[in-house]
């Protein structure tokens, strides 16, 4: 296994609709044709997997149907979008990239993006 540098923004603020997007960029040492991207959430020293996708270079990044993540890839950059976020989902979201093919296998883990989610204030009742 070889190490690989992964860069991602330090902080992102989710939209009022609970959507957060960020770019995960990896320093590929060669021409990888099979890449696995995983988003992990670290909160209170607990790490959980948010979503993962394997893609062949030049093809679309496809997550599972019930995934809260979507994404696109361009070269060594992956544009990730996480939706359905609420205030309780605030935390550090870590991008992990694995170059599965061709050998050798490379593993890169970013420092994480702190995503802040603020639940929108409920609209006040209107009297007509």
């Amino acid at each position: 296994c070889k190490a690989m540098h992964v860069a991602q923004p330090a902080v992102v603020l989710a939209s009022s609709r609970g959507i957060a997007s960020f770019v995960c960029e990896y320093a590929s040492p060669g021409k990888a044709t099979e890449v696995r991207v995983t988003v992990l959430r670290q909160a209170d020293s607990q790490v959980t997997e948010v979503c993962a996708a394997t893609y062949m270079m030049g093809n679309e990044l496809t997550f599972l149907d019930d995934s809260i993540c979507t994404g696109t890839s361009s070269g060594n950059q992956v544009n990730l979008t996480i939706q359905g976020l609420r205030a309780m989902d605030t935390g550090l979201y870590i991008c992990k990239v694995e170059l599965m093919y061709p050998p050798p296998y490379y593993l890169g883990i970013g420092n994480g993006t702190q995503i802040y989610v603020i639940d929108p204030e409920p609209c006040p009742d209107s009297d007509f």
Partner: nanobody, 119 residues
């Protein structure tokens, strides 16, 4: 705890065939690269063949056209079909799984199975 258990080794004549199997106790097939390595006496352990979750396959030059690696996710098993065996294929064959789980790099090895090619 993941365990890799190889089987199928043995003594075979030159030109013969064997099929090695590697059964995993945990479901590591969907996320990790599975491979076969071999180690001859007094030599280092070398990659024979590997297969990725996406089905991409890599072979050592010395076995191309003779060996075939495959996997069965339903059975959590990876296979190495070895045809046209030569005396220089004699070695202990090891199953390997490598990749990551959460933030940790993982690598698992089987205990090895002996393949001897001799007349």
């Amino acid at each position: 705890e993941v365990q890799l258990v190889e089987s199928g080794g043995g003594l075979v004549q030159p030109g013969g065939s064997l099929r090695l199997s590697c059964a995993a106790s945990g479901n590591i097939f969907t996320r990790n690269v599975m491979g076969w390595y071999r180690q001859a006496p007094g030599k280092q352990r070398d990659l024979v063949a590997s297969i990725t979750p996406g089905g991409n396959i890599n072979y050592a030059d010395s076995v191309k056209g003779r060996f075939t690696i495959s996997r069965d996710g339903a059975k959590n098993t990876v296979y190495l079909q070895m045809n046209s065996l030569k005396p220089e294929d004699t070695a202990v064959y090891y199953c390997n799984a490598h990749g990551s789980i959460l933030l940790d790099r993982i690598e698992y090895w089987g205990q090895g199975t002996q393949v001897t090619v001799s007349s």
